[in-house]
Interface confidence: low
Amino acid sequence: HTAAQDNCTCPTNKMTVCSPDGPGGRCQCRALGSGMAVDCSTLTSKCLLLKARMSAPKNARTLVRPSEHALVDNDGLYDPDCDPEGRFKARQCNQTSVCWCVNSVGVRRTDKGDLSLRCDELVRTHHILIDLRHRPTAGAFNHSDLDAELRRLFRERYRLHPKFVAAVHYEQPTIQIELRQNTSQKAAGDVDIGDAAYYFERDIKGESLFQGRGGLDLRVRGEPLQVERTLIYYLDEIPPKFSMKRLT
């Protein structure tokens, strides 16, 4: 792992406890909440981050903004069950034995049920739409410059391969970033679009998950890009299964 050796911290996840007790006295970091070892050379999975967040003080919590569109995280935060790889388990339950199925980004994709509810597989979220509204500026941003800057951000800050940034649309003041990553496209070592989107969402809210880095300072040709609202839509490889009651 690439945890910073000198002061033994995790550059990509500040919600960790690190100590030099790895092989050969190497720095090893474990996620808060789960105690799972994390690879500090890449992004930590969203499941482990949510679990760590739920173990943090209550006043650190914020809810994800709800929306009526597509599959959106209307449920906000919960304490998830993660598998040994740090991915969300397909079935999630709360302390009152209410259960539901989630997709690979941990968003509920079925009605809530009881302990008898079956979730046969973890369905992959292969398309994420990040809708941003920026604060008023002197003029519209140049689309090409904006596109290049956002691709650079996802590549350099979140280590997401540019081929997974399918498009950047812009109609002032709305910016839409499309992330696409099918199961077949994701190679070993590739950052997951769900994890990149989550880090980006937290950065936009001023709640950076990176250790010791300044907050996100987004600029397009020197002009600050300040986001005033964010909505994230998730599209799964298999459509979600909700009762008609929820859809009305």
């Epitope: 290049a148 691709r151 650079r152 590549r155 540019p162 081929k163 997974f164 399918a166 498009a167 499309e178």
Partner: antibody, heavy 121, light 107 residues
Framework: EVQLLESGGGLVQPGGSLRLSCAAS????????MNWVRQAPGKGLEWIGR????????HYNQKFKDRVTISVDKSKNQFSLKLSSVTAADTAVYYC??????????????WGQGTTVTVSS | ETTLTQSPAFMSATPGDKVNISCKAS??????VAWYLQKPGQSPQLLIY???YRYTGVPDRFSGSGSGTDFTLTISSLQAEDVAVYYC?????????FGQGTRLEIK
């Protein structure tokens, strides 16, 4: 200024190989697929293939698959086309062109000026 | 492989005319179609992408429409400088393919 500049065209013997280069400038090379497209005299446009400068992933038109190689030198912002076992049917203007990642952007917004290859003995 | 068929192959029109060029895909390509013009001795130039989005700097007399398999490029008021060969291209799947071209001349 965003620019693509091809080089290496000229006369090639039948059965030989053509090698072309394309130098990119004025944009972030690693944000785009880099493509080769050709146009035979008086004919339409034909896509040969493309390369991702980040990891050298290539996609080729099946028509050329067995005799085409596209490679990249990221440090020089340059990519190349090698087409082997050429025949007179490979006589064409060869263009390099960029396209974005994600099929939403698989169109060609910047083209080189083209380099002419003539296959003849 | 998706085949694109353009019609007409050749057309002649008068300055000021409205011109339509058709492009039909052999299979559904959603809205992933681009249009280019190519003037004699020059490289192709992008006009329209994603069926209806005008590329930066393209005059607004050029517009595109369609989805699925049927697409149209429209020049609302033909100018003398629009003499060129026009190509459609699908950017839905590889191999990326082009129509055979439509040669547009001024009467």
């Amino acid at each position: 200024e965003v620019q693509l500049l091809e080089s290496g065209g000229g006369l090639v013997q039948p059965g030989g190989s053509l090698r072309l280069s394309c130098a990119a400038s004025g944009f972030t090379f690693s944000n785009y697929w880099m493509n080769w497209v050709r146009q035979a005299p008086g004919k339409g446009l034909e896509w040969i293939g493309r390369i991702d400068p980040n990891d050298s992933e290539t996609h080729y038109n099946q028509k050329f698959k067995d005799r085409v190689t596209i490679s990249v030198d990221k440090s020089k912002n340059q990519f190349s086309l090698k087409l082997s076992s050429v025949t007179a049917a490979d006589t064409a203007v060869y263009y390099c062109a960029r396209s974005g990642f994600g099929s939403t952007y698989w169109f060609f917004d910047v083209w080189g000026q083209g380099t002419t290859v003539t296959v003849s003995s | 492989e998706t085949t694109l068929t353009q019609s007409p192959a050749f057309m002649s029109a008068t300055p000021g005319d409205k011109v339509n060029i058709s492009c039909k895909a052999s299979q559904d390509v959603s809205t992933a179609v681009a249009w280019y013009l190519q003037k004699p001795g020059q490289s192709p130039q992008l006009l329209i992408y994603s069926a209806s989005y005008r590329y930066t700097g393209v005059p607004d007399r050029f517009s595109g429409s369609g989805s699925g398999t049927d697409f149209t490029l429209t020049i609302s008021s033909l100018q003398a400088e629009d003499v060129a060969v026009y190509y459609c291209q699908q950017h839905y799947s590889t191999p990326l393919t082009f129509g055979q071209g439509t040669r547009l001349e001024i009467k």
